[in-house]
Amino acid sequence: MNGRVDYLVTEEEINLTRGPSGLGFNIVGGTDQQYVSNDSGIYVSRIKENGAAALDGRLQEGDKILSVNGQDLKNLLHQDAVDLFRNAGYAVSLRVQHRLQVQNGPIGHRGEGDPSGIPIFMVLVPVFALTMVAAWAFMRYRQQL
């Protein structure tokens, strides 16, 4: 692979109201059906057109669902996770991890490893800015001496 794909990770609380046809999405993942290697988490694989999730607009295909109504989704069998959603009631609160894909360098395909990388420029830009401010302050200080 020629480049590296990184992710800017954000979390969001999404409150959905179950519609006539339910919540309107599919999931993959679980301890018995890992979608990402070394990660048994639950991921949104499909947002159904005109479903509750699609109409709300915040949940995206590829999002990781961390909890449902406050209940952690870690270390669950796939079917147990499915059942948790199906029995979650009319008002459903989802804690969701969004991953914004950021391309660094030449284009390469998306890896399946650690999904929580931080883009390098997110670190370098503030460091560079701080260095510039420090240098300016130092020069001003020398001029005053």
Epitope: G22, N26, I27, Y43, V44, S45, E61, G62, F85, R86
Partner: nanobody, 128 residues
Framework: EVQLVESGGGLVQAGGSLRLSCAAS????????MGWFRQALGKEREFVST????????NYADSVKGRFTISRDNAKNTVYLEMNSLKPEDTAVYYC??????????????????????WGQGTQVTVS
């Protein structure tokens, strides 16, 4: 949003072979069920083949069984349709389609044959 681009179509003699490719971009490819469909001039679009998001399950229309093979390469974000022993009746525009795999959180139901969320523009296959 998923973008699908088909390639590999063309003109081939009866009995010949072609390999269609469908390159996907825009979303994590390896969570999508992928399908191939075709539409001959003046006819309805018809199902050809599907492969599940895990790659472990494939399905074929009776008319292509034993001649066509669907496969996917998640590292390359690409799905393929290997077409052998082509017949004039295989002449059509071939479309690639994608839909999120996995399990509905709402109920167990059979997903419709044409219930795909994303479609490519198609590639022409002509068998003379």
């Amino acid at each position: 949003e998923v973008q699908l681009v088909e390639s590999g179509g063309g003109l081939v003699q009866a009995g010949g072979s072609l390999r269609l490719s469908c390159a996907a971009s825009g979303r994590p490819f390896n969570m999508y069920d992928m399908g191939w469909f075709r539409q001959a001039l003046g006819k309805e679009r018809e199902f050809v083949s599907t492969v599940s998001w895990t790659g472990s399950s494939t399905n074929y229309a009776d008319s292509v069984k034993g001649r066509f093979t669907i496969s996917r390469d998640n590292a390359k974000n690409t799905v393929y349709l290997e077409m052998n022993s082509l017949k004039p009746e295989d002449t059509a525009v071939y479309y690639c389609a994608a839909r999120g795999g996995g399990t509905s959180v709402d109920s167990d139901y059979d997903v419709g044959e044409f219930e795909y969320d994303y479609w490519g523009q198609g590639t022409q296959v002509t068998v003379s």
